[in-house]
Interface confidence: low
């Protein structure tokens, strides 16, 4: 009733979005929550994350292991007070991921 | 001083950041606003869309071409009143991105 | 091998615009981190930091002399030009081009500008 | 702006014995980053300076280990552990840590 093929593409297409561990451009800064009179150049690296689709709307993709790997970048303080530095920065790297409950919205209930 | 590979890995990994069309799951009901009692197997698929770092903090990463491709899913209504069907749903695409600078917060400042 | 070479006129006259160009090899000011700046040295006298230039285009000058300097740069043709207005004989220099790493380590061999009418 | 103040600003030395020079800050070099951006240059007649020690006590590559650099906050030391005629030259000492980056006055070392 239903072509074969077309099945095929679409379950090729549902595994490619399910949760998992995906490349994902994250904001140094914002992830380590550094001052204001400091940043980083490139602001952004590349680290996977939990990411996609969960079978059903009470779950949701959350990571169930983390690696931490370290990305050379230039830190800079403002006003530039010193020549950029490179510095290693260790990000969090979701290498699990898991379909889990999230947590009730009412403690109690 | 600062080593030349260094440097060249930073910089394409840089490169690798920066704003792209870049391929995201999307949850298909939430993007057509459909009624809650019509549900679509799978609930995601794989689309392009706009992401990744730009340069200042004023600027944010946004679509400038889009395009719409027409996905196969099972369409299905709750209660089931009838075999799941087969449908075409179109998805935007994103073909095109910019770092745009973000709506001023007060539109009259 | 980083190679950073000073060039402009040996003889400036007073209240004249003096341009220099540094002109480097083995490396780009495109790459991540990279800078290229300009120290001075008067005869017999002390190293005095002028200004700097970044990949990404920013410039940084010594506040002492921010409103007489410009400082640019012309990435494909791997050149820095600093541009000082209203020259006078005190500016009399031995003008360095300096990779800007912490520290510098990379120098050109200086040009001697002589201010004088 | 921070002054760098450098002794002395002669220093006659025989070979074979030890010499020492000192520069101090107007202010303290520790960078909020936690470095401190002191470093020390050897200006050989006729030359561009020449890097010898970085942040405070790291001696460049190539460097040879007679030199040495010490110091912290405000005050900062270079000592030669025994003079060869080849280290003849005016030393500077030289901050990056606060904008403008200034130098020391020099002091030149010369063989009796």
């Known amino acids: 009733f239903y072509d074969i093929e077309t099945l095929k593409v679409i379950d090729e297409e549902w595994q490619r979005t399910q949760c998992s561990p995906r490349e994902t451009c994250v904001e140094v800064a914002s992830e380590l929550g550094k001052s204001t009179n400091t940043f980083f150049k490139p602001p952004c690296v590349n680290v996977f994350r939990c990411g996609g689709c969960c079978n059903e709307e009470s779950l949701i993709c959350m990571n169930t292991s983390t690696s931490y790997i370290s990305k050379q970048l230039f830190e800079i303080s403002v006003p530039l007070t010193s020549v950029p530095e490179l510095v290693p920065v260790k990000v969090a790297n979701h290498t699990g991921c898991k379909c889990l409950p999230t947590a009730p919205r009412h403690p109690y209930s | 001083f600062y080593d030349i590979e260094t440097l060249k890995v930073i910089d394409e990994e840089w490169q690798r950041t920066q704003c792209s069309p870049r391929e995201t799951c999307v949850e298909v009901a939430s993007e057509l606003g459909k009624s809650t009692n019509t549900f679509f197997k799978p609930p995601c698929v794989n689309v392009f869309r706009c992401g990744g770092c730009c340069n200042e903090e004023s600027l944010i990463c946004m679509n400038t071409s889009t395009s719409y491709i027409s996905k196969q899913l099972f369409e299905i209504s709750v209660p089931l009143t009838s075999v799941p069907e087969l449908v075409p749903v179109k998805v935007a695409n994103h073909t095109g991105c910019k770092c745009l600078p973000t709506a001023p917060r007060h539109p009259y400042s | 091998q980083v190679t950073l070479k000073e060039s402009g006129p040996a003889l400036v006259k007073p209240t004249q615009t003096l341009t220099l160009t540094c002109t480097f090899s083995g490396f780009s000011l495109s790459d991540y981190g990279m800078g290229v700046g300009w120290i001075r040295q008067p005869p017999g006298k002390a190293l005095e930091w002028l200004a700097n230039i970044w990949w990404e285009d920013d410039k940084y000058y010594n506040p002492v002399l921010r409103s007489r300097l410009t400082i640019s740069k012309d990435t494909s043709k791997n050149q820095v030009v600093l541009t000082m207005t209203n020259m006078d004989p005190v500016d009399t220099a031995t003008y360095y081009c300096v990779q800007v790493t912490n520290p510098f380590v990379f120098w050109g061999e200086g040009t001697l500008v002589t201010v004088s009418s | 702006d921070i002054v760098m103040t450098q002794t002395p600003l002669s220093l006659p030395v025989t070979p074979g014995e030890p010499a020492s020079i000192s520069c101090r800050s107007s202010?303290?070099?520790?960078?909020?980053?936690?470095?401190?951006?002191l470093h020390w240059y050897l200006q050989k007649p006729g030359q561009s300076p020449q890097l010898l020690i970085y942040k405070v006590s790291n001696r460049f590559s190539g460097v040879p280990d007679r030199f040495s650099g010490s110091g912290s906050g405000t005050d900062f030391t270079l000592k030669i552990s025994r003079v060869e005629a080849e280290d003849v030259g005016v030393y500077f000492c030289s901050q990056s840590t606060h904008v403008p980056w200034t130098f020391g006055g020099g002091t030149k070392v010369e063989i009796k």
């Open positions: 202010q303290s070099l520790v960078h909020i980053n936690g470095n401190t951006y």
